[in-house]
């Protein structure tokens, strides 16, 4: 059974802001204008690494920066989860693990992140631009999905950035408030861009970083602003598709909606959102999708001789939220 | 939308079993929970189990031995089967679906209920 | 076993009238994210339940803002600032927080 504060929380690898120090202000606003976008929703961050002792072998940690109780993490590779990519892992905080090969060992590292060690010999060992994808699924948040692979030239040791930039994003808008220095910040914000609206914007390039290896940084958000400051960059394509494996297929089932609870006035028949309000997106590459009560369409990974089952511990038990953090 | 659809009223005898479906439709199956609620004629409402497909049930202890909450997930369904069954069984059965995966409640969605009578 | 207690049984409503309806239980429902993990429902004359306030006070989608809830650790209350005729039934509040779950025993709305 997993309770509260059962491990410590662990944090991310940071993104990087280079040159912050030298657009000190023409970065405030954009820095703003990401608090205001983003406060109060959660990101999910992954981290895809090439062992160096095993070229072909690979660690994929994600992890979920926000206040919910998790219930659900799935580890897929060649895409989202719903969108042609094939599940890996799927890990319950209460009910167990359950992995189809090429994974090799999926595990809870705290509880809010995971990693997952997939094997590397075989027709379905992954190469190294695969995509590999992480969806949380949270109250209140709803379900978050971000991607991230290894770049084709990436040294053995080395690990690609973190990908905080979430493909499903859900938010009970509204559910943890707007500060009044926030509320300020924005207004502040909205100052700085009429100032400033015909000054090129800065570049905010994420910069590469092992966890091994903490560097030095000209400018580091807050660890309180951590969950809401983020870096968001496009999700790699890969050009490279796992081998088809026999013990998990592809989804090929339509999407689907579930039901919402929300606070219209009808129950709406397509995706909506728990709150009325609805997150921005920052960028065209982040889609805005509100998956709490709206969960992508997937058919089930087929049991098969690459299934590990994690036995289900039976009966009654002590549950820490209702999704599942018991 | 997704929507529950349950199977047909059941009149049993004494220390036989039965067994209730609930089909999802329109939605993803393996890794939601679907709980099975009881309501006997006049009285309130009673949490019997639930079942996560990918990874197995759990169940009440009151039920614990008598109850099986299995899932099929090439049909997307859901049985709830009840052994050794005694005229206080006597219950209309819901299978209801939280919204959200791995999460058990609030049941945002209900089968429209089976009725079940045990009578010799 | 969190055990759910509700009161009234009872409860004879006069249209356009408000009504509350307490639920209390042996245990706190607060759960570390700072939400409470109550739900209520309303089960209509012949009708499976439907979901109508969860976590302590968030309105489920199509619940009309007549209805709301409050309340935090072991004492909750739903409110209708107004009774309509088609709120007639059977309530119920149902803890999620800890297995197994449990649900009140349930208060009955009925028209003068």
């Known amino acids: 059974m997993r309770t509260e504060a059962q491990v410590p929380a662990l944090q991310p690898p940071e993104p990087g802001l280079e040159g912050a120090m030298g657009h000190r202000t023409l970065v405030l606003p954009w820095v703003l204008l990401t608090l205001c976008v983003t406060a109060g929703t959660p990101e999910v961050w992954v981290q895809v690494r090439m062992e160096a002792t095993e070229l072909s072998s690979f660690t994929i940690r994600c992890g979920f920066l926000g206040s919910g109780s998790i219930s659900l993490v799935t580890v897929s590779w060649g895409g989202p989860n719903g969108a042609g990519g094939t599940t890996l892992a799927v890990l319950h905080p209460e009910r167990g693990i359950r992995q189809w090969a090429p994974a090799r060992q999926a595990r809870w590292e705290t509880q809010s992140s995971i990693s997952l060690i997939l094997e590397g010999s075989g027709a379905s060992s992954p190469c190294a631009n695969t995509t590999f994808c992480c969806k949380f699924a949270s109250f209140p948040e709803g379900s978050w999905e971000a991607c991230g692979s290894l770049p084709p030239s990436s040294d053995p040791g080395l690990s690609a950035p973190p990908t905080p930039a979430p493909i499903l994003r859900a938010d009970l808008a509204g559910i943890l408030g707007v500060s009044g220095v926030l509320l300020f910040g924005c207004v502040y914000l909205l100052h700085l861009l009429r100032r400033h609206k015909h000054r090129p914007a800065p570049r905010l390039q994420p910069s590469r970083t092992s966890p091994q290896a903490p560097r030095a940084r000209a400018w580091a958000p807050s660890q309180a602003s951590q969950a809401a400051l983020h870096v968001p960059y496009a999700t790699i394509n890969t050009s490279c598709r796992p081998a088809t494996l026999d013990t998990a297929h592809p989804h090929g089932g339509p999407s689907w909606w579930a039901s919402l609870p929300t606070h219209a006035a009808h129950r709406p028949q397509g995706p909506a959102a728990w709150a009325s309000t609805p997150i921005p997106a920052r960028g065209s590459f982040v889609s805005v999708e509100n998956g709490l009560y709206a969960q992508a369409g997937e058919r089930p990974p087929h049991t098969g001789p690459g299934l590990t089952l994690f036995p289900d511990p039976r009966g009654p038990r002590a549950m820490e939220g209702p999704l599942g953090v018991r | 939308q997704v929507q529950l659809v349950q199977s047909g009223a059941e009149v049993k005898k004494p220390g036989s079993s039965v067994k209730v479906s609930c089909k999802a439709s329109?939605?993803?199956?393996?890794?939601?929970?679907i709980s099975w609620v009881r309501q006997a004629p006049g009285q309130g409402l009673e949490w019997m189990g639930d079942?996560?497909?990918?990874?197995?049930?759990n169940y009440a202890q009151k039920f614990q031995g008598r109850v099986t909450i299995t899932a099929d997930e090439s049909t997307s369904t859901a049985y709830m089967e009840l052994s050794s069954l005694r005229s206080e069984d006597t219950a209309v059965y819901y299978c209801?679906?939280?919204?959200?995966?791995?999460?058990?409640?609030?049941?945002?969605?209900w089968g429209q209920g089976t009725m079940v009578t045990v009578s010799s | 076993d969190i055990v759910m207690t509700q009161s009234p049984l009872s409860l004879p409503v006069t249209p356009g009238e408000p009504a509350s309806i307490s639920c209390r239980s042996s245990?706190?429902?607060?759960?570390?994210?700072?939400?409470?993990?109550l739900d209520w429902y309303l089960q209509k004359p012949g009708q499976s339940p439907q979901l109508l306030i969860y976590?302590?006070?968030t309105r489920a989608s199509g619940v009309p803002d007549r209805f709301s809830g409050s309340g935090s650790g072991t004492d909750f209350t739903l409110k209708i600032s107004r009774v309509e005729a088609e709120d007639v039934g059977v309530y119920y509040c149902?803890?999620?927080?800890?297995?197994?779950?449990?649900f009140g025993g349930g208060t009955k709305v009925e028209i003068k």
């Open positions: 209801a679906r939280g919204p959200l995966e791995g999460k058990v409640s609030p049941f945002d969605i």
């Open positions: 079942i996560i497909p990918i990874f197995g049930s």
């Open positions: 245990q706190s429902l607060l759960h570390s994210t700072g939400y409470n993990y």
């Open positions: 329109g939605g993803t199956f393996s890794t939601f929970a």
């Open positions: 976590v302590g006070s």
């Open positions: 149902m803890q999620e927080r800890q297995f197994p779950i449990t």
